[in-house]
Every structure is written in structure tokens, then in C-alpha cells.
């Protein structure tokens, strides 16, 4: 807590400007009006304050807004955002995507901090669902964001938002998460033609059931082995040798290199040797 001291004569700040960088911490506390600071927050980021001076400015804002900062202040926090605790952020009501972007930019290049996680949680809860624009923004800053959500949280993602998802956004998703996302993706992309549909749905196929894989095998999709290896084992096991051959197309030769790994290993053990021999890959059931 900064001790309360009177502002020296002639030092009362008429505006927020660079002259304040020469103020000691106690002078900032005594001579800067919190309401003035709040209305001129958009000037703070271009003024080279020290970490200690920023602590004082935060303290002043905290005193002015004990119930949480208004969005007009939050949008211009800049580096001060990193001084906020999750407890501070839980008091905020952030509704503007522009504000969210401005704050995420401050933390760019770093792991998702507790502050950022709290901010995102508040923002998404305030919106009621993870809409396309929000998802677009969050995955741009944190490609792993989608896979950090629980299946329950993912269930609030509307199918229309799936258009914002890029393949790399799903890299760390587990099967339970893909089980939730796949039906939404199927719905989102349902009006696309065969080859275009496969390009879009491919990264979600870890949640696809057997019947959908069978349907894809009839469409000359030429699935690569990396995608095949991410399929649900229980969805792959019922596929026939002919269906897998059609599903993989020219990539079928890759099965040999993966014969000891799931789901290929388990699928091979399910097949008749005569059928496996038709592939000419030397697979042993």
C-alpha cells in the first residue's frame, strides 16, 4: 500500500503525459487524479513508465473502480493488463471483441497465462456461446485453445463456428473432444461437394463413426496415413480390407510401416489373412 501524502505545490498533473515519468511513486499516487487517468488511459501506453510506476497507476484504478474496471478503461490497459490478477479480471464485463484482441496481443508469444484464461472465460460466458468471430480470434492467438476446452464446453460451440477452425487448431485434441466436434463439422460442411468436403472434414475425422468412414471410402478421397492413424480404433475395426483400400487409395502402402501401431495393428488382427494378402503388403494377421 502506497502511503497517502499531499501533492507538492505545482505538481498536480493537469493531464496524463510523459512528464509523469519523472514523478516518484508517491508523487504519482498523490498528484495524479484517478478519474483523469481513467479518461486518458489511451495515452499511457506511449509513455515510458517503469514497472513500479505502472503498479501505482493500477492501484489508482483499483481505488476508483473497486467493483471492476469499465470496458472503456480495459481496452486501453496495454501492458498494465499483465499486472492484473485473475481476481481483478473476474470483476470485468468485457463484451467487445476489439477489447479482447487488444488484451490478447499484450500476452502474444507467451503461454496462456491465468489472466488470459480468466479473460477468455469471462468473455465467452458473457457471449453465451463460442461464436465464429470469437473462435477465430482465440485460435489465431492460441492455436491449441479449442483442445483446451472440455467436451462439455465444446458442446456450446455452434456448427457455424467450425468454419473458423484450422487443422492445426485440432492438433492436441483427444478423441473425446473430437467426438463432440466431428458432428458439428459434419453439419457445418454438409453442403460441400465430395473433394471439398473431405479437405474440410479431414482434421475432424478422429471423431467419425464407422458408417461415415464407409461412406468416405466410396468417394475416392485418398486419406493419408497420418489422418488414418488418428481415427477411432472402434470406428476402424469394422472396416473391410476393400473399404480401407478404397479409403486410403495410393496411401494404402503405408499400412506396412504402421502395422505395429494402433489402430492398424488392431484392424489387421480382425481381418482374414486371405483378404490382407490381396493388398500385397505382407501384412500378417
Amino acid at each position: 500500500e502506497v502511503e497517502k501524502t499531499a501533492c507538492p505545490s505545482g505538481k498536480k498533473a493537469p493531464e496524463i503525459d510523459e512528464s509523469l515519468i519523472f514523478y516518484k511513486k508517491w508523487e504519482l499516487e498523490a498528484c495524479v487524479d484517478a478519474a483523469l487517468l481513467a479518461t486518458q488511459m489511451d495515452r499511457v501506453n506511449a509513455i515510458p513508465f517503469t514497472y513500479e510506476q505502472l503498479d501505482v497507476l493500477k492501484h489508482k484504478l483499483d481505488e476508483l473502480y473497486p467493483q471492476g474496471y469499465p470496458e472503456s478503461v480495459i481496452q486501453h490497459l496495454g501492458y498494465l493488463f499483465l499486472k492484473m490478477s485473475p481476481e481483478d479480471i473476474r470483476k470485468w464485463n468485457v463484451t467487445s471483441l476489439e477489447t479482447l484482441k487488444a488484451l490478447l496481443e499484450v500476452n502474444k508469444g507467451h503461454e496462456m497465462s491465468p489472466q488470459v484464461a480468466t479473460l477468455i472465460d469471462r468473455f465467452v460466458k458473457g457471449r453465451g456461446q463460442l461464436d465464429k468471430d470469437t473462435l477465430d480470434t482465440l485460435t489465431a492467438f492460441y492455436p491449441g485453445y479449442l483442445c483446451s476446452l472440455s467436451p462439455e464446453e465444446l458442446s456450446s460451440v455452434p456448427p457455424s463456428s467450425i468454419w473458423a477452425v484450422r487443422p492445426q487448431d485440432l492438433d492436441t485434441c483427444d478423441p473425446r473432444q473430437l467426438d463432440v466436434l466431428y458432428p458439428k463439422a459434419r453439419l457445418a460442411f454438409q453442403n460441400m461437394n465430395g473433394s471439398e468436403y473431405f479437405v474440410k472434414i479431414q482434421s475432424f475425422l478422429g471423431g467419425a463413426p464407422t458408417e461415415d468412414l464407409k461412406a468416405l471410402s466410396q468417394q475416392n478421397v485418398s486419406m493419408d496415413l497420418a489422418t488414418f492413424m488418428k481415427l477411432r480404433t472402434d470406428a476402424v475395426l469394422p472396416l473391410t480390407v476393400a473399404e480401407v483400400q478404397k479409403l486410403l487409395g495410393p496411401h494404402v502402402e503405408g499400412l506396412k510401416a504402421e502395422e505395429r501401431h494402433r489402430p492398424v495393428r488392431d484392424w489387421i488382427l480382425r481381418q482374414r489373412q486371405d483378404d490382407l494378402d490381396t493388398l500385397g503388403l505382407g501384412l500378417q494377421g
Epitope: 495515452r43 515510458p48 513508465f49 486501453h76 487488444a102 496481443e105
Partner: antibody, heavy 121, light 106 residues
């Protein structure tokens, strides 16, 4: 990656005005102030002013107060500088530069390629 | 406004030679930045906040100083270091730059 793409060279008559642009990409435009710097041929660098694209707040070097007008369009992530009442003294290369506001830094860390302005009758 | 005076204005150095460029401020500043500029290109942030090397800057560069006196040093000159170097103070608006030091390869 961060990029600032400036508009092409301008040739103008004395007394005329020019408006140049600086399109930002690779970062959140509203999170950083955009500064403008002048460099006359064979000369040093002169700071003109900055704009906070989020609010439109501007701060000018007193020397350029009546010469330059800074604006920004958030929707296109573009900053603009208009120079009016041009004279031969305004012939120069003008740079936009992003200002990185971190207490360890506070510096113009990315610069545009520059817009050359030639004032000639 | 704070006036920055660089010296020398022009200098030449042989490969392997130690180079020091100085920047003197008309009043005390808390930090100094240095920019490198080669002909026909934009200035590049080279050293920030007195002594921190910007990304990609070779370790042979260093910066130091305080108050009104700052310097940039190259421990061993290399051909690619030939350029103009500008100091810039970050303490007070208007932001100001030094007049530049043109470093040539001997």
C-alpha cells in the same frame, strides 16, 4: 510476422497536400501506437508524432503541428498521414513505425519501407 | 526538447577493429535506443533501452551509458556493420534522434 506496408512515392506541387498510408499486418493494430518519422535526403531522422489507433488520440512534435495530420482506420488496420501546404522542405522519405509499449522496451520496433515525397513545381 | 549529439559524424574502421560511437544528451535521459540504417532501407532497431540487443543483432555489438552519456560499441568490426547509426531518447516527447554516425569500412 509483423509488416507495415506503406503507399507509393508521391510527386506534388508546392501548396498541395498528400495523404500516405501505412497498412499493418501480423499483429493487433489497436494494441500499439503508430509513430511517423521524417528523413530528408542525406539527413537524419525527425519524429513527427503518433496516433493511438484504438482511440484516435494523437500527439505531435510542435514543429509538425500545422503540417501533419494523423488518422487511423481500425477496420482496415491502416494508419494515414496527410501533409498540407507542401514546400520543398517537405521533400523527404516518411516512415511509419510501430511503438512497442513494454517497460523494458518502449521503442519503435518495426518500420515501414518508407514513402518518398517530392515537392516540385 | 532534448538534443542528442553524436560523435563522430563519420568514421572508418578496419575489419577486426574495435569501434565506439557516442551520444550525448542535452539533459539527462533514462534510456537510449540505437538504430542501424543502410542506404535505401528503413532504420532497424539495433539496441533498445541502452544495452539490450534487438533480435538478430550480432553479439559483437553492445550498448552502455546513463544520464547524458551513452555509447554503442562493436568489439570487432565486420564488413556488414558498415552503416549509419542513430541514437534516440525515449524519455521525453518530442522523441529525438541524434544526427547519425556514418561508419565506413576501411
Amino acid at each position: 510476422q509483423v509488416q507495415l506496408q506503406q503507399s507509393g512515392a508521391e510527386l506534388a506541387r508546392p501548396g498541395a497536400s498528400v495523404k500516405m498510408s501505412c497498412k499493418a499486418s501480423g499483429y493487433t493494430f489497436i494494441s500499439y501506437t503508430m509513430h511517423w518519422v521524417k528523413q530528408r535526403p542525406g539527413q537524419g531522422l525527425e519524429w513527427i508524432g503518433y496516433i493511438n489507433p484504438s482511440s484516435g488520440y494523437t500527439k505531435y512534435n510542435q514543429k509538425f503541428k500545422d503540417k501533419a495530420t494523423l488518422t487511423a482506420d481500425k477496420s482496415s488496420s491502416t494508419a494515414y498521414m496527410q501533409l498540407n501546404s507542401l514546400t520543398s522542405e517537405d521533400s523527404a522519405v516518411y516512415y511509419c513505425a510501430r511503438y512497442y509499449s513494454n517497460p523494458d522496451y518502449y521503442a519503435m520496433d518495426y518500420w515501414g519501407q518508407g514513402t518518398s515525397v517530392t515537392v516540385s513545381s | 526538447q532534448i538534443v542528442l549529439t553524436q560523435s563522430p559524424a563519420i568514421m572508418s574502421a578496419s575489419p577486426g577493429e574495435k569501434v565506439t560511437i557516442t551520444c550525448s544528451a542535452s539533459s539527462s535521459v533514462s534510456y537510449m535506443h540505437w538504430f542501424q540504417q543502410k542506404p535505401g532501407t528503413s532504420p532497424k532497431l539495433w539496441i533498445y533501452s541502452t544495452s539490450n540487443l534487438a533480435s538478430g543483432v550480432p553479439a559483437r555489438f553492445s550498448g552502455s551509458g546513463s544520464g547524458t552519456s551513452y555509447s554503442l560499441t562493436i568489439s570487432r568490426m565486420e564488413a556488414e556493420d558498415a552503416a549509419t547509426y542513430y541514437c534516440q531518447q525515449r524519455s521525453s516527447y518530442p522523441l529525438t534522434f541524434g544526427g547519425g554516425t556514418k561508419l565506413e569500412l576501411k
